[in-house]
């Protein structure tokens, strides 16, 4: 399987909400012995590998933000902890996997990574990640709502969470 980022850059005004999205696609085994662990974290564009370092999102670690289920099942974080920090991660039946961040501040700017781990009974884990940049802007140059720039350099798109 692979992970695709629908957008590589999100530019948002301060105070707005945004939903960052990844999609799991390709052959996904829905058998009993396969489960998927999905999570989000902040990172940096490392010299060797992007998304190698795992930093918290608003003080919540990747452990706090994870989803865990079999196949393309739907799931979302019910953790009060995440919601108290204005965060919620979710996954649908179609392989879409997202994190919503509410009331953005300049401190939220940075590189965000989605991580998917496929766990197969008695096999090595298969890890895949996607990366996207969030830029939170303030002042007269800030857009009126979030603008998302597709990964394959097509036209930008206005989005709301």
């Amino acid at each position: 399987f692979k992970v695709a980022t629908l957008y590589s850059l999100y530019v948002c005004p301060e105070g707005q909400n945004v939903t960052l999205t990844c999609r799991v696609f390709g052959p996904v085994d829905k058998g009993h012995d396969v489960t998927f662990y999905k999570t989000w974290y902040r990172s940096s564009r490392g010299e060797v590998q992007t998304c190698s370092e795992r930093r918290p999102i608003r003080n919540l670690t990747f452990q706090d933000l994870h989803l865990h289920h079999g196949g393309h099942q739907a799931a979302n974080t019910s953790h009060d902890l995440a919601q108290r920090h204005g965060l919620e991660s979710a996954s649908d039946h179609h392989g879409n996997f997202s994190i919503t961040m509410r009331n953005l501040t300049l401190l939220d700017s940075g590189l965000y990574c989605c991580l998917v781990v496929e766990i197969r009974h008695h096999h090595s884990e298969h890890r895949v990640h996607g990366a996207m940049e969030l830029q939170v802007q303030t002042g007269k140059d800030a857009p009126s709502s979030c603008v998302a720039y597709p990964s394959s350099s097509q036209e930008s798109e206005n989005i709301t969470a």
Partner: antibody, heavy 118, light 107 residues
């Protein structure tokens, strides 16, 4: 306080049984996979067994397969290791450790000593 | 099973000196390797994850590198509290395996 506390170790004769417990606190235990890892006196670390957050799948090291059983009770925030047919080579400090897919053992207990001797 | 071989078995150094520890895997573990520190009477502590990333709260004097089969942990300038045993561990394959450890002792 985020911690793991093992108990249940002690002196047992070869062929005997023991049940180790690990009490978790300060984090959402049911979110985590867990492992037992042991360390024979003056020796290195050996992974023993692993259990997912839901209780399945479960894995064992070949050295304990068929003799040890790992289990958990998420309602009690507890992890267990039932050890049967104990041998002298099972003598070790047994640690429980927190685990996650695509991650490492980021939280360990202080360990409990199991001595198998006649 | 993947065998991890650490060298040297013992490293005798003075505070302030640089320590270089090696871990070699019998087959590739990609970058799925961690380093732990263990002091006498204590449980191990995660130092490095995914071959080169410092875990939360680990000082910058600890650094690590490598991928595939050859990995290195470096302590740039030894502090008194760094004298301990260091283990590498892989999670690329079952079973999870550890190296036999390198003891860093005061010279």
């Amino acid at each position: 306080q985020v911690q793991l506390v093992e108990s249940g170790g002690g002196l047992v004769k070869p062929g005997g049984s023991l049940r180790l417990s690990c009490a978790a606190s300060g984090f959402t235990f049911s979110d985590y996979y867990m492992s037992w890892i042991r360390q024979a006196p003056g020796k290195g670390l050996e992974w023993v067994s692993y259990i997912s957050n839901s209780g399945s799948p479960i894995y064992y090291a070949d050295s304990v397969k068929g003799r040890f059983t790992i289990s958990r009770d998420n309602a009690k925030n507890s992890l267990y290791l039932q050890m049967n047919s104990l041998r002298a080579e099972d003598t070790a400090v047994y640690y429980c450790a927190r685990d996650l897919p695509g991650w490492y053992f980021d939280l360990w207990g202080r360990g409990t000593l199991v001595t198998v001797s006649s | 099973e993947i065998v991890l071989t650490q060298s040297p078995a013992t490293l005798s150094l003075s505070p302030g000196e640089r320590a270089t520890l090696s871990c070699r895997a019998s087959q590739s573990v990609s970058s799925y390797l961690a380093w732990y520190q263990q002091k006498p009477g204590q449980a191990p502590r995660l130092l490095i994850y995914d071959a080169s990333n410092r875990a939360t709260g680990i000082p910058a004097r600890f650094s690590a590198s490598g991928s595939g089969t050859d990995f290195t942990l470096t302590i740039s300038s030894l502090e008194p509290e760094d004298f301990a045993v260091y283990y590498c561990q892989q999670r690329n394959n079952w079973p999870r395996t550890f190296g036999q450890g390198t003891k860093v002792e005061i010279k």
